[in-house]
């Protein structure tokens, strides 16, 4: 059976990953577009997130605006929003399961049930990690594709925002934490009735001879 240290490490990494997904979801920096005006005072940096966009003027003044409707959100970010929210919910379930199945908690008495719960928590964290890595990587793929598109104007290239890097880190933590929890094998203790039955059978055999 995996050591308590490994289990604690797995839960800690997964919880950190869960918090990072929330940060990734909240930060309005999925895509960054620098509009460099020919007149320097007209330059602006645009940050696009899942919930709002922000405009930073050349003066340093920043204005953020929550999207009026779902239709105002680019389609790839609409899908990303859905997947990231589901990932947060799924990871929350993973945290709950890992608390229930933890070696240092008394929610479950049976060690075997605890171990199985911990494996399920690990699988849940792995799923949450995959749900983050997909939209983050897809958004990054679209940005990179645009970067090498000859039809896209110079100076108008979109760049990967901090949220994408946070998202990758979050998925890494969730996958690593989930992986460690999946190493939690159920205990292989012999059941008492089996031992008694086997002893009884061998005694009977020796009497017979």
């Amino acid at each position: 059976m995996a050591s308590m240290g490994l289990q604690v490490m797995g839960i800690a990494l997964a919880v950190l990953g869960w918090l990072a997904v929330m940060l990734c979801c909240a930060l309005p920096m999925w895509r960054v577009t620098a509009f460099i005006g020919s007149n320097i005072v007209t330059s602006q940096t645009i940050w696009e997130g899942l919930w709002m966009n922000c405009v930073v003027q050349s003066t340093g003044q920043m204005q953020c605006k929550v999207y009026d409707s779902l239709l105002a959100l680019p389609q790839d970010l609409q899908a990303a929003r859905a997947l990231v929210i589901i990932s947060i919910i799924v990871a929350a379930l993973g945290v709950l399961l890992s608390v229930v199945g933890g070696k240092c908690t008394n929610c479950l008495e049976d060690e075997s049930a605890k171990a199985k719960t911990m494996i399920v928590a690990g699988v849940v964290f792995l799923l949450a990690g995959l749900m983050v890595i997909v939209p983050v990587s897809w958004t990054a793929h679209n940005i990179i594709q645009d970067f090498y598109n000859p039809l896209v104007a110079s100076g108008q290239k979109r760049e990967m925002g901090a949220s994408l890097y946070v998202g990758w880190a979050a998925s890494g933590l969730l996958l690593l934490g989930g992986g460690l929890l999946c190493c939690n094998c159920p205990p292989r203790t012999d059941k008492p009735y089996s031992a008694k039955y086997s002893a009884a059978r061998s005694a009977a055999a020796s009497n017979y001879v």
Partner: antibody
Amino acid sequence: EVQLVESGGGLVQPKGSLKLSCGASGFGFSSYAMSWVRQAPGKGLDWIATISIKTQNYATHYAESLKERVTISRDDSQSMVYLQMNNLKTEDTAFYYCTVNIPFDNWGQGVMVTVSS
Amino acid sequence: NIVMTQSPKSMSISVGDRVTMNCKASQNVGNNIAWYQQKPGQSPKVLIFYASYRFTGVPDRFTGGGYGTDFTLIINSVQAEDAAFYYCQRIYNSPYTFGAGTKLDLK
């Protein structure tokens, strides 16, 4: 202050050729895409062509309806952009504007090109 | 080839009114739209880029919106100096096609 000054316009015969020039100042010319837009009298804006910057190998983009007859070029050392127009038609009569960046955040005052016999 | 269709072709309104003009792209262009204002005898000026971002110095009565194929330019509390032609344009990707324009007159 950004300044774009077009020149080379005037009266041209149908099937003739013309080269428009645009001198730029007040900004880092070599860092910006440059474009030509025209406007026939009393009509709307009509994008003609755009030329990108050196890091994009001076990629050129043309309006489908005009690409056989026009060529855009630039000279970064002189801060100039050019529009070569061939096989001119009467419907090419318009004001021709030189613009910078995308979106077109600065425009010249325009130069008139009249195609008539 | 992408086509930008603007409506209405012209409108006549009073000072203080709220105006909405539309631009429809023949295919999905994301938020890659700019709006320009052109007053008689002048060169055009950019008002909005990336569908909803006001260009520096543009009054906040001008608001852009939309995504994909349908876009709007709203002018809240129209002023006398807003009488002009308004054009939408596909930006970011070539071809940088313009709409036919909307003429805004004041009563």
